[in-house]
């Protein structure tokens, strides 16, 4: 099983140019306990919360968010109403943070592709998204053949590559940035020149939120090494300007629940300070 990933896609609505929708999804085996959508940067690092979605408690959203909803068990959408005439959303970064069990907290950011035509963005799917400016160049069959061939090639290459191991890290503040899966030259033209950067940051974990089953988060002492798309055939290629920031929080089971606990709260590894939440406090 590959490293969990988060994808983000920003779409401008074809009918109303002032309306935008942010789609986010989590690609991983764990169960999602909380999703936070922010704009202007990652949550807790200069970003402003737009919505918080709990899989059972409900959603909370704030202007300019119009409607936040779960699209599937592992993906959400957030409709935004742009009241301004100059459409500030077009140049804004939107970030989605998924707190999941047992993987921890994973965040990804993205913005509207610079050359995007309203309504042309394909809806997010759990398979690689092929974004071509010249859509007519590649027929559907060509795309499928190319995709299958490329996947087979990657899988064959993966067989001969040593498996990445967990790298122990003894510094909580350590950050590791690596270029991930640069697409081949042939595919770059067809794939709208996409790229993605995996940014793995290790933070002292604070119990901003805790798991419904009373699991607690400890400071991370190990991190997943980034893997390319060969690790998972269902990795979408992120639109240009996106990056994947992986905050890897390892969970350990707390012996007993705290005296006062809240519903299904999620643990977010967090670099904002030592204040810890003693309950399973989550986001609303």
């Amino acid at each position: 099983a590959g490293t969990p990933e988060v994808w983000v896609q920003v779409q401008m609505e074809a009918t109303e140019l002032s309306s935008f929708t942010v789609h986010c999804g989590f690609l991983g085996p764990g169960s999602i306990s909380l999703v936070t959508v922010s704009w202007g940067g990652p949550d807790g690092a200069g970003g402003t919360k737009l919505a918080v979605l709990h899989p059972e408690l409900g959603t909370r959203q704030w202007a300019p968010a119009r409607q936040a909803r779960w699209e599937t068990q592992s993906s959400i959408s957030l409709a935004l109403e742009d009241s301004g005439a100059s459409s500030p959303f077009a140049n804004t970064t939107f970030c989605c943070k998924f707190a999941s069990f047992p993987e921890g907290s994973w965040e990804s950011c993205g913005s509207l592709p610079p050359s995007s035509d309203p309504g042309l963005s394909a809806p997010p799917t759990p398979v690689p998204i092929l974004r071509a400016d010249l859509a007519g160049i590649l027929g559907l069959s060509g795309v499928l053949l190319f995709g299958c061939g490329y996947l087979l090639h990657l899988l064959r290459r993966q067989k001969h590559r040593p498996t990445p191991r967990l790298q122990p890290s003894h510094t909580n503040s350590q950050a590791l940035t690596a270029q991930a899966w640069a697409p081949s030259q042939a595919s770059q033209a067809a794939l709208h020149d996409p790229y993605a950067t995996i940014n793995t940051s290790f933070c002292p974990a604070t119990l901003d939120t805790a798991h419904p089953n009373g699991w607690a988060s400890l400071p991370t002492h190990a991190a997943h090494q980034p893997q390319g798309p060969a690790a998972s055939a269902s990795t979408p290629i992120l639109a240009r300007g996106s990056f994947v920031s992986v905050e890897n929080g390892l969970y350990t089971q707390a012996g007993e629940r705290p005296p006062h606990t809240g519903p299904g709260l999620t643990l977010f590894p967090d670099c904002r300070g030592p204040r810890a939440l003693e309950g399973r406090f989550g986001v609303r």
């Epitope: 402003t48 599937t72 939120t209």
Partner: antibody
Framework: EVQLVQSGAEVKKPGSSVKVSCKAS????????IEWVRQAPGQGLEWIGE????????NYNEKFKGRVTFTADESTSTAYMELSSLRSEDTAVYYC???????WGQGTLVTVSS | DIVMTQSPDSLAVSLGERATINCKSS????????????LAWYQQKPGQPPKLLIY???TRESGVPDRFSGSGSGTDFTLTISSLQAEDVAVYYC?????????FGQGTKLEIK
């Protein structure tokens, strides 16, 4: 332990304003909304609105728009609800709550009487 | 706004017997995307704030005794106390957690017969 501690009971004249405080502890204050709910004597629960500390983003129940103001002070982890143009029917216990109504303050009784 | 209607308004049940409270919403509380029902149940004792018992229509909050259970989907929901205890005497509220504004039922007063 997550705690929400509210200010004490208030007696107000019709037409005046009241400001109720709610001090949060045990979690990162800016992470979650503070909700405000009221309960008139012998009646049910009525949502007034919410504020997200940090960004100070708010949502209001239409019924209270224009009469209620939410503020939050991150330095003291305290949220405030101010209700103006008070009338006798605003007599109620006012609660602050957080995290999808999982945590509640003890309530503040506001009595509006001439 | 979604209107939440509870029945009955009051209920008297003998100790050890089953108590059932119903809640009906004016719109569906089911999110088709993740197939979750956004309904919560609260218990309120005199002089105290409400206490969350059940969320997601059927998920019991941590620390809530397993005699409390929630069921239902869409617009019709039920809170069941399988064996009534003296400490369960309270007013129970259902709440729409599906969409703004959050709305509560009028409450059901549960007493011992």
């Amino acid at each position: 332990e997550v705690q929400l501690v509210q200010s004490g009971a208030e007696v107000k004249k019709p037409g005046s304003s009241v400001k109720v405080s709610c001090k949060a502890s045990g979690y990162t204050f800016s992470s979650f909304s503070i909700e405000w709910v009221r309960q008139a004597p012998g009646q049910g629960l009525e949502w007034i609105g919410e504020i997200l500390p940090g960004s100070n983003s708010t949502n209001y129940n239409e019924k209270f728009k224009g009469r209620v103001t939410f503020t939050a002070d991150e330095s003291t982890s305290t949220a405030y609800m101010e209700l103006s143009s008070l009338r006798s029917e605003d007599t109620a216990v006012y609660y602050c709550s957080s995290y999808w109504f999982a945590y509640w303050g003890q309530g503040t009784l506001v009595t509006v009487s001439s | 706004d979604i209107v939440m209607t509870q029945s009955p308004d009051s209920l008297a049940v003998s100790l050890g017997e089953r108590a059932t409270i119903n809640c009906k919403s004016s719109q569906s509380l089911l999110n088709s995307g993740n197939q979750k029902n956004y309904l919560a149940w609260y218990q309120q004792k005199p002089g105290q704030p409400p206490k969350l018992l059940i969320y997601g229509a059927s998920t019991r909050e941590s620390g809530v005794p397993d005699r409390f259970s929630g069921s239902g989907s869409g617009t019709d929901f039920t809170l069941t106390i399988s064996s009534l205890q003296a400490e369960d005497v309270a007013v129970y509220y259902c709440q729409n957690a599906h969409s703004y504004p959050p709305t509560f039922g009028q409450g059901t007063k549960l007493e011992i017969k």
